[in-house]
Structures are given as structure tokens and as C-alpha cells.
């Protein structure tokens, strides 16, 4: 009896694992084995596929074959007993295109009201993703074990901290990877659960803010108790993107080590241009808090988000305000290469009733003013980037008198 060729061959590639599955064509024939050949693009000859010769089951693994994952490959299969079936050819494919991202490896760290998630690719030193290692982003689903209400967090990197959790509560999560450059979404990791600890005696510092004064940065935060000492650390923000189980080398800000106030001042030249993460910790000598939430700090935006400079042209019923670039020390204008929104506050000099205008344009009309009346104006700039969400301080108020009633044109 002629052996029939196997049918419905499926190629599954997850990370560096290459798995073939197929259907037997004739279940009634026993002791049949199966063998595969492969052929690379531009080659005429077929080569035996190691790991997939004389297989008795309907599944084989050819991960040991060192393939160029960007090169097209063709496979064929046949059944063998005393004789052999004809070859069945599988549609050619490119391993990289076909590959799925496997489940990432996840480690969890618990605090009282936070969980740190360390994520690394499931396959160490993967050949498939060798050129894309730095491009992985992750997303996760987290829920309280008791409620099951899920929250999704997108676009995170290899270290992510989730805050504002409840103490002594079990949280569960699963993580998947994505390579947005290749439109690939990975497989979820197994579910990992961890219980947050009992509430710590000392809470972490809160509401950390950075501002610029003269040539210094001023870092301020809030704290519940008095007579504490604080320390501040920084980390390059890009390091969070590093793949694998990275060592995060948080560094001390020397002027912010063991400070006894809820602020510290340090020179701008402590930081080169870049984006940093900052965190603060409190101690009373016996106990130490967990670290505060990490805030993102962009030196360019911090240093250069100075209050806008503006000129007022006074008419009888309005002001025309022309907003210019703020001046650095030395009177040179600051080039701002990110979009800003301007908030303009104005009020009658004799009143406290303030009115507000929000404008993207740099020439703004303040309408509905009374003639021959003194109005004061102040302005500040906001970045339009939601993530950075920074504001300058207000400019000094400038007061001008409107013209008499017939000069509106």
C-alpha cells in the first residue's frame, strides 16, 4: 500500500524555539516515521533537517539548526515505513517574520504600598531578537487577588514600579513583550503573585518637585513628620530600558545627602543634559522609609522652562501681548525646541479679580478692557508633553494703562 504524505504542517516559532507539527494522513498505518528536509533561498539542493529525522510522533524541534533568521527557508516532509511517501512541501517562510515573542521572565519585589517589577526576555541572548534587544517594550495586567478587577499598564520597560497599593494585599500580574518596530506582540508570562508587606512605620516622601533658581536646582518634597533626615538619588532614565536583569546604579546627589529640611539646593552643573529619575528617602535615625515615587526630570525643560518675556501694546479696549523667548543670564534668548502653551493672567490694578487666557500662539489679544484703566499682566509657560508636564514660574507682573476711548483702531 502506498504511504500518503503527511498534511497540514504548522511551523511554530517562539523566540529561538522552532517547532513543527503535522497531521498523519493515514491513522490506520502503524510504525510510520517522518522526516524533513530544508532548503535555503537560492539553493537547489535539499538538506536533512537535524532533529527532525525518523520521528515517530507528529511534532519535532529543530531549534539546534543555526539559521539566518532573516533568510527565507523552505521545508518538505515525507512519511516512511518500508517505502516512503512523496514529499509534501511546506510554504516557504522567513523565521523572523513568523516568530512570536515568548513570555518574558518576571521577578517581583514587594514594599508596603508598591511593587517593583523586573522584566527580562524569556530567552537569554536570543538569536531571533539579537538586533532588537533594546527595542522591547512591555505591557502588563495587574489585579488584586481578592477582586480580580484588572488594570492594564502599557509601554513599560525592564524595570517598573507600581505605587499607591494597599499594604498586606496580594496582587497578581502577567506581562507580555512587544516589538513595535516589527509589529509583534508577545505571549503573556505565567501569572505571578506577591503580597505587599505590613505598612512601614515611616511613609516615603511625597510631592517631589524641581525648580530652577539662579544657577541652581531646588528640589522640594513634603513629609509627614519633623526631625527627619533625607537623602536624594538619581538615575539616568534611559537605563530603565536596558534589557535583562540590569544593575541600576542609583547615585547620591552630594548636596542632598542627610539633609534635615524638606528641600535641597544643588548646582545645575551636577547634571549634564539629559533625562533623569529622582527619588527621596526619609530616616529618623532608627527607621528608614521606602523610596518615594520616582519623578522624571528633564534638564533641558527644567533649565529652560523660564517664564516668558512679553511686550504689551495698549489700546483703549484691549492689550496686544507679544510673547518672546525668555532671556538667559547674559541677555541671550533661550531657544525652545518643544511646543509650549502660555497661560496669561490679567487683572485690574485696583481689584483682585483675575482673568485667565490660555494660548498656543505667541501673539495674544486680551479683549474687553476699560479705557484709561491700569491692568496688570503676568504669564507662564507650560510644556504640551503630558509625560513631562512642566510649568515655568510666573513672570513678574507688568502693569499698563489702556488708551482713551477712541484709539481702538
Amino acid at each position: 500500500k502506498n504511504l500518503k504524505s503527511p498534511q497540514k504542517v504548522e511551523v511554530d516559532i517562539i523566540d529561538d524555539n522552532f517547532i513543527l507539527r503535522w497531521n498523519r494522513s493515514d491513522e490506520s498505518v502503524g510504525n510510520v516515521t517522518f522526516s524533513f528536509d530544508y532548503q535555503k533561498t537560492g539553493m537547489d539542493n535539499w538538506i536533512k533537517l537535524s532533529g527532525c529525522q525518523n520521528i515517530t510522533s507528529t511534532k519535532c524541534n529543530f531549534s539546534s539548526l543555526k539559521l539566518n533568521v532573516y533568510e527565507e527557508i523552505k521545508l518538505r516532509i515525507r512519511a516512511e515505513k518500508e517505502n516512503t511517501s512523496s514529499w509534501y512541501e511546506v510554504d516557504s517562510f522567513t523565521p523572523f517574520r513568523k516568530a512570536q515573542i515568548g513570555p518574558p521572565e518576571v521577578h517581583l519585589e514587594a514594599e508596603d504600598k508598591a511593587i517593583v517589577i523586573h522584566i527580562s526576555p524569556g530567552t537569554k541572548d536570543s538569536v531571533m531578537w539579537a538586533l532588537d534587544g533594546l527595542s522591547f517594550t512591555y505591557s502588563l495586567v495587574i489585579w488584586k487577588n481578592s477582586s480580580g478587577v484588572e488594570e492594564r499598564i502599557e509601554n513599560i520597560y525592564s524595570r517598573h514600579k507600581i505605587y499607591k497599593l494597599s499594604p498586606e494585599t496580594t496582587y497578581c500580574l502577567k506581562v507580555k513583550a512587544a516589538l513595535l518596530t516589527s509589529w509583534k506582540i508577545g505571549v503573556y508570562s505565567p501569572v505571578h503573585c506577591i503580597k505587599t508587606t505590613v505598612e512601614n512605620e515611616l511613609p516615603p516622601p511625597e510631592n517631589i518637585e524641581v525648580s530652577v533658581q539662579n544657577q541652581n536646582y531646588v528640589l522640594k518634597w513634603d513629609y509627614t513628620y519633623a526631625n527627619m533626615t533625607f537623602q536624594v538619588q538619581w538615575l539616568h532614565a534611559f537605563l530603565k530600558r536596558n534589557p535583562g536583569n540590569h544593575l541600576y546604579k542609583w547615585k547620591q546627589i552630594p548636596d542632598c545627602e542627610n539633609v534635615k529640611t524638606t528641600q535641597c539646593v544643588f548646582p545645575q552643573n551636577v547634571f549634564q543634559k539629559g533625562i533623569y529619575l529622582l527619588r527621596v528617602q526619609a530616616s529618623d535615625g532608627n527607621n528608614t522609609s521606602f523610596w518615594s515615587e520616582e519623578i522624571k526630570f528633564d534638564t533641558e525643560i527644567q533649565a529652560f522652562l523660564l517664564p516668558p518675556v512679553f511686550n504689551i501694546r495698549s489700546l483703549s479696549d484691549s492689550f496686544h501681548i507679544y510673547i518672546g523667548a525668555p532671556k538667559q543670564s547674559g541677555n541671550t534668548p533661550v531657544i525652545q525646541d518643544y511646543p509650549l502653551i502660555y497661560e496669561i493672567i490679567f487683572w485690574e490694578n485696583t481689584s483682585n479679580a483675575e482673568r485667565k487666557i490660555i494660548e498656543k500662539k505667541t501673539d495674544v489679544t486680551v479683549p474687553n478692557l476699560k479705557p484709561l484703566t491700569v491692568y496688570c499682566v503676568k504669564a507662564r509657560a507650560h510644556t504640551m508633553d503630558e509625560k513631562l508636564n512642566k510649568s515655568s514660574v510666573f513672570s513678574d507682573a507688568v502693569c499698563e494703562k489702556t488708551k482713551p476711548g477712541n484709539t481702538s483702531k
Partner: antibody, heavy 119, light 107 residues
Framework: EVQLQQSGAELVKPGASVKLSCTSS????????MHWVKQRTEQGLEWIGR????????KYAPKFQGKATITADTSSNTAYLQLNSLTSEDTAVYYC????????????WGQGTSVTVSS | DIVMTQSQKFMSTSVGDRVSVTCKAS??????VAWYQQKPGQSPKAVIY???YRHRGVPARFTGSGSGTDFTLTISNVQSEDLAEYFC?????????FGGGTKLEIK
Amino acid sequence: EVQLQQSGAELVKPGASVKLSCTSSGFNIKDSYMHWVKQRTEQGLEWIGRIDPEDGETKYAPKFQGKATITADTSSNTAYLQLNSLTSEDTAVYYCARRGSSLYAVDYWGQGTSVTVSS
Amino acid sequence: DIVMTQSQKFMSTSVGDRVSVTCKASQNVGTSVAWYQQKPGQSPKAVIYLASYRHRGVPARFTGSGSGTDFTLTISNVQSEDLAEYFCQQFNIYPWTFGGGTKLEIK
């Protein structure tokens, strides 16, 4: 393969100083923190301090401030522990160890260097 | 400094038994706790990190648990090669501190 090779045993006189070395292979010490730990005979482990070889930043346990100085030479992939004003209390085995990931405290240890302080 | 207390200096067990070594921190250290095994005449070897994760190559009979201030290293189905001293360590806050150690003796 990660390995930490420590210098040989030392017999030193009270009041003198000694400098121990820990040479690493299989990884770059710049990417790690290098720690030193003391263990006296039949006693527990005491953390002395650590260095970030990338920039030389150090942290010490208060007890060893002034007693120990940790340095590193990235060109030879070596960390050092110098102990000053030695007394019999400093007689111990000293281990170097590396921290290679934020997940771990330390993941690899050297074989230890025995220091004996005796006149 | 955070004090790590291993209340039992010695523990006696038999091959095949299950034994639990405990460690208490003087303040909340989250899950930043490691366990080390030190056999006689050898340097310490990492067994557990982040309170509950096994280092590569460590047999599955070793499990770590706990968070906050109370931590446990459990060895199920104790083998003769587990004869050693076990140390806990917190790495949440500098200076890092070790427990005093628990010597496991095989009957």
C-alpha cells in the same frame, strides 16, 4: 564563567596595613558593584562596604569607616581592600563578592583571603 | 543599622526531613533579603534572592518565603550535602547586614 580570584594569605604585625586584591574574570567589574565581607573564625559575616568601579563611589558600614578603604582598577578588573592600623580584632577571612544585578545582593564570592595579625 | 536575628544558632535534622530556618529584621525591608549557604572551609554561596527566588543551580528543595520583617528558608527532603551554615542578609538599606547564622547538623 564568572570567577573572583583573591590574593594569598597575609601575616602582618599590629599597627601595620595590608592591601588585599580580588581579580575578576568572566565579567567586567565596571558593570557591577564589588563588595567586601569579613568573617572571623567561628563567627558570622560582616559587611564592610562596596565600590562602584565605574566611578569609584564607595559605601562603608559605620564600623569600618576609617579602618577600611575600597578601591578598584578597571584596567586590570581588580578590586582592592586596604585595612589600616591592624589589631588582633582584624584577624579574619576577608571575602570579595560581586553584585551583578539589582535582583541580587551578591551572586558570586571569591575564595577568601586569610589575614592574621600577630607580633 | 538594621539587625537581622537568626534565633536558632544550631538545628539538628535527619536526611529526608524538612527543616525551616528563620530570620527576623528589626524593620521592614520589603523582600530585599538573600540567603547564603556556607559549607565548612568554603566561601558562602548564594541560595535565595529577593526573599523567594532560587539562584540558578540551586535544587528545588530549597524555598524562601516571607516579606517585611519575617523570613524563612525551608529545605524539604534534607540531603547530607545540605550540612552547612545558613545566613540571611538584608540588602534594602545600607549598611547591608547579615544574620548571625544557623548551623544545620545532620543526625
